[in-house]
């Protein structure tokens, strides 16, 4: 019998202090650059080694960023999202959605992380 992959979705508030070279990560996404089908959200595509995000350790590649300093990132053009990050100041608060892949049992068993549940 085949196993099935589900996702456990969690949210976290991450406070970063801007480093000498900025926030230390790259983003993809936006209404004009969809990274995930039918989702114009903003995602982390790369964490810079020894940058602010890497040194903090909580932000991961693939995370979805829901808000910056309380400002929602829904329905933004990619460049508008970039500008929001770049102008966010020295102390930056990120609301982040992590998707943790979990391997469940045989098909038919609904696991804890099943998004359809």
């Amino acid at each position: 019998m085949n196993g099935r992959v589900d996702y456990l979705v969690t949210e976290e508030e991450i406070n970063l202090t801007r480093g000498p070279s900025g926030l230390g990560f790259n983003i993809v996404g936006g209404t004009d650059q969809q990274y995930v089908s039918n989702d114009s959200g903003i995602y982390v595509s790369r964490i810079k080694e020894n940058g602010a995000a890497a040194l903090d350790g909580r932000l991961q590649e693939g995370d979805k960023i829901l808000s910056v300093n309380g400002q929602d990132l829904k329905n933004l053009l990619h460049q508008d999202a970039v500008d929001l990050f770049r102008n966010a100041g020295y102390a930056v608060s990120l609301r982040v959605q992590h998707r943790l892949q979990v391997q469940n049992g045989p098909i038919g068993h609904r696991g804890e992380g099943d998004p359809s549940g």
């Epitope: 230390g24 790259n26 983003i27 790369r46 990619h78 970039v82």
Partner: nanobody
Framework: DVQLVESGGGLVQAGDSLRLSCAAS????????MAWFRQAPGKERDFVAT????????NYADSVKGRFTISRDNAKNTVTLQMNSLQPEDTAVYYC???????????????????WGQGTQVTVSE
């Protein structure tokens, strides 16, 4: 398998032009920031130019501003570097580089890029 393949290098006279191309495969090109770097013998790899995912935003090293132009074609997965008024000091191996997404930490350091081509030699004689 990610591949960046440069072409268009060669030997030219001072004042001449060259057009370098970089063909990308194995990546979703439209998500990538692309750049050109160069490395002269015995020197470090230096930033030349970068272009954002859509081609709407470019950045150049001071030494090439007004002479070099970076552009991209997302339909063809290519990035080009048009080099005009070439000078002997432009002699170097030119590398194409790419990184997924838009950087919030800078785009002029070679360490900011994940994928690299093998390079193409540009030699400018007096």
């Amino acid at each position: 398998d990610v591949q960046l393949v440069e072409s268009g290098g060669g030997l030219v006279q001072a004042g001449d032009s060259l057009r370098l191309s970089c063909a990308a495969s194995g990546i979703t090109f439209r998500w990538y920031t692309m750049a050109w770097f160069r490395q002269a013998p015995g020197k470090e790899r230096d930033f030349v130019a970068t272009i954002n995912w859509s081609g709407s935003d470019t950045n150049y090293a001071d030494s090439v501003k007004g002479r070099f132009t970076i552009s991209r074609d997302n339909a063809k997965n290519t990035v080009t570097l048009q080099m005009n008024s070439l000078q002997p000091e432009d002699t170097a191996v030119y590398y194409c580089a790419g990184v997924p997404g838009t950087s919030l930490s800078g785009e002029t350091d070679p360490r900011d890029y994940d994928y690299w081509g093998q390079g193409t030699q540009v030699t400018v004689s007096e």
